[in-house]
């Protein structure tokens, strides 16, 4: 659910970390209406997720750890 690179809502699916190659943070105070995590998947899809949800935080933490260890 995105428009002009802004997420307008959140996915109603849960994604597995193995499906995700990276993420971008969307901040409501930077020109978009809502805070979001935009997951970039192996199928070259961008998926808008709720940054407050535990599964989203978990994947962000995993990916951040991966980047740190590179």
């Amino acid at each position: 659910a995105s428009n002009f690179d802004c997420c307008l809502g959140y996915t109603d699916r849960i994604l597995h970390p193995k499906f995700i190659v990276g993420f971008t943070r969307q901040l409501a105070n930077e020109g978009c209406d809502i805070n979001a995590i935009i997951f970039h998947t192996k199928k070259k899809l961008s998926v808008c997720a709720n940054p407050k949800q535990t599964w989203v935080k978990y994947i962000v933490r995993l990916l951040s750890k991966k980047v740190k260890n590179m």
Epitope: L15, H16, K18, F19, K42, T54
Partner: antibody, heavy 120, light 107 residues
């Protein structure tokens, strides 16, 4: 040790609702998802949905949307699954199962199952 | 939704046999696959997670392999307690769909 204890068997009439409970012990209740899976007689396993006890977030199988509601009570470490507008095809054993990020989103502990019979 | 197809649906084998059960996904699930064992009247038990990892307490005669759309559960030497029904499960994306099951029976 981790234990999931479910409520007892239920017999319901078509159109009624059923609420099954699952009491967790032996681990930090809010650190793991709780899934609900059912198995109808002679059928395979079917995933109904999950609840994240930490924030009440739910994710339901579209097949049950509008009929299933999952809730939790952190004070008693109990999750509930309510299924409404019951029909004969809902006759099944219903399981709660702990969802664990650490085992690749696997369901590593299961309740003993609750048989729900829908019959007029 | 991702569809999971197991084969065979039933299988007769003897104690000591090597047995292979396959599971195919309708699309690439990138190894996000788990295997469960279910015995009559008992709750399912997690055997393999992440396609290849053995769950706690599961004997080493069980192993999982595969990638992309195709996955395999192997029991290297069947024991009497292994006769049960086995299910694969997609966990790539909700809904977390199961295969229809493979019933392993004594020959």
């Amino acid at each position: 040790q981790v234990q999931l204890v479910q409520s007892g068997a239920e017999v319901k009439k078509p159109g009624a609702s059923v609420k099954v409970s699952c009491k967790a012990s032996g681990y930090t209740f809010t650190s793991y998802w709780m899934h609900w899976v059912r198995q109808a007689p002679g059928q395979g396993l079917e995933w109904m949905g999950l609840i994240d006890p930490s924030d009440k977030y739910t994710n339901y199988n579209q097949k049950f949307k509008g009929r299933v509601t999952m809730t939790r009570d952190t004070s008693t470490s109990t999750v509930y699954m309510e299924l409404s507008s019951l029909r004969s095809e809902d006759t099944a054993v219903y399981y709660c199962a702990r969802g664990n990020y650490g085992v690749d989103y696997g369901m590593d502990y299961w309740g003993q199952g609750t048989l729900v019979t829908v019959s007029s | 939704d991702i569809q999971m197809t197991q084969s065979p649906s039933s299988l007769s084998a003897s104690v000591g046999d090597r047995v292979t059960i396959t599971c195919g996904a309708s699309e690439n699930i990138y190894g996000a696959l788990n295997w469960y064992q279910r015995k009559p009247g008992k709750a399912p038990k997690l055997l393999i997670y992440g396609a290849t990892n053995l769950a706690d307490g599961v004997p080493s005669r069980f192993s999982g392999s595969g990638s992309g759309r195709d996955y395999t559960l192997t029991i290297s030497s069947l024991q009497p307690e292994d006769f049960a029904t086995y299910y694969c499960q997609n966990v790539l994306i909700t809904p977390y769909t199961f295969g229809q099951g493979t019933k392993l029976e004594i020959k």
